[in-house]
Amino acid sequence: MAVTACQGLGFVVSLIGIAGIIAATCMDQWSTQDLYNNPVTAVFNYQGLWRSCVRESSGFTECRGYFTLLGLPAMLQAVRALMIVGIVLGAIGLLVSIFALKCIRIGSMEDSAKANMTLTSGIMFIVSGLCAIAGVSVFANMLVTNFWMSTANMYTGMGGMVQTVQTRYTFGAALFVGWVAGGLTLIGGVMMCIACRGLAPEETNYKAVSYHASGHSVAYKPGGFKASTGFGSNTKNKKIYDGGARTEDEVQSYPSKHDYV
């Protein structure tokens, strides 16, 4: 039950995260005009990964797409690439994880296959989240660098009346959406990987022979975990899913795929 919950929650968290990554990628407010000394402005500029916009005092907004590939800064291209890779990996991860969900039955799919798919989707979510976080962080770093460069330009070498007040840009809403979404996708991926461990049918090592006094049996806890006897017991505490109380001899004598429902 806990595994199903962990897997389901991981899927939902990742789904929200990837939706957020898509939203952040499409948003126009990656960088917004810094209103450092003028909280009310007649012309407000903001920029996204795909276009830049200007909102006038009347509310009229005009956006212009970046209709060039070669003319764009390499960093912007890199951020675009990271976000797209994040979205693609996340989308594939979601597709894989749907089939991996324990609550969904697809034919006679083995639990081992579901476990592998859960792990795969988990890794994909982790990489997707890292791509988004990296993309947003690269853009944020670019903004910080440009911000201080433009600040330096504003206050040095002017020698009198300032002729051009350079527009400084600061963090836009998309950056925060991207960071949160990337984090959620990452968390969802980790949860999927944790759920995978619980789903994976771990084989008992049947070659080992345990020696103990005759008649001494090893009880099973109601939760399905082997009680540790300390003598000849499996100290790894491996989980079985039928929850039945059997002797260790019985477990060894009748290994069957039905031990793992």
Epitope: T41, A42, V43, S57, S58, F60
Partner: antibody, heavy 120, light 113 residues
Framework: EIQLQQTGPELVKPGASVTISCKTS????????MLWVKQSHGKSLEWIGN????????TYNLKFKGKATLTVDRSSSTAYMQLNSLTSEDSAVYYC?????????????WGQGTSVTVSS | DIVMTQSPYSLSVSTGEKVTMSCKSS????????????LAWYQQKPGQPPKLLIY???TRESGVPDRFTGSGSGTDFTLTISSVQAEDLALYYC?????????FGGGTKLEIK
Amino acid sequence: EIQLQQTGPELVKPGASVTISCKTSGYSFTDYLMLWVKQSHGKSLEWIGNINPYYGRTTYNLKFKGKATLTVDRSSSTAYMQLNSLTSEDSAVYYCARDGYSLRNAMDYWGQGTSVTVSS
Amino acid sequence: DIVMTQSPYSLSVSTGEKVTMSCKSSQSLFNSGNQKNYLAWYQQKPGQPPKLLIYGASTRESGVPDRFTGSGSGTDFTLTISSVQAEDLALYYCQNAHSYPYTFGGGTKLEIK
């Protein structure tokens, strides 16, 4: 036809207050910013402030903050400007003007102006 | 505040002549976000309110005769009347529409000889 109709001339005593109205017609009042401009006799134009009729949000020229108060009545599509603590410096013609929305913050329609004379 | 300086203070020309008036701003009115200049030109005839002629430094308002042309970028702007008509007798103002507070130039008075 778009029209901005302002009230007639006002003669007021120093220290008093006056409210100028600007009744609009021919367009959707809440869709355009309303601006107010002062023109002292034989002088240039001064922007007082503007108001967004939809939200009632105002932006003032710091020079006129406390002097002018901008309001709107959406039901009658009318903008108002109240001038308080009047002095001889406030004697001028006051215009209401509409922001042209997509015209790079330019004012495309103007009222005929209201002359305010402050005299004892 | 952005200071708008217009020159000359007054012009006296004959009808049919070409006239040019200048407007300079203390800060750039060019917006890099959309590559536009936020400057407007108004015409004010005696006893009338101002009338918009040019916005965005060079775009003619609808209904304005094509003899009126706006040009310039950044801090230097020009209004040109290619062939002055008698009805062009008026005061011409330029306006900073880029930053609050909006500011106007002192005006250029056009007189007909």
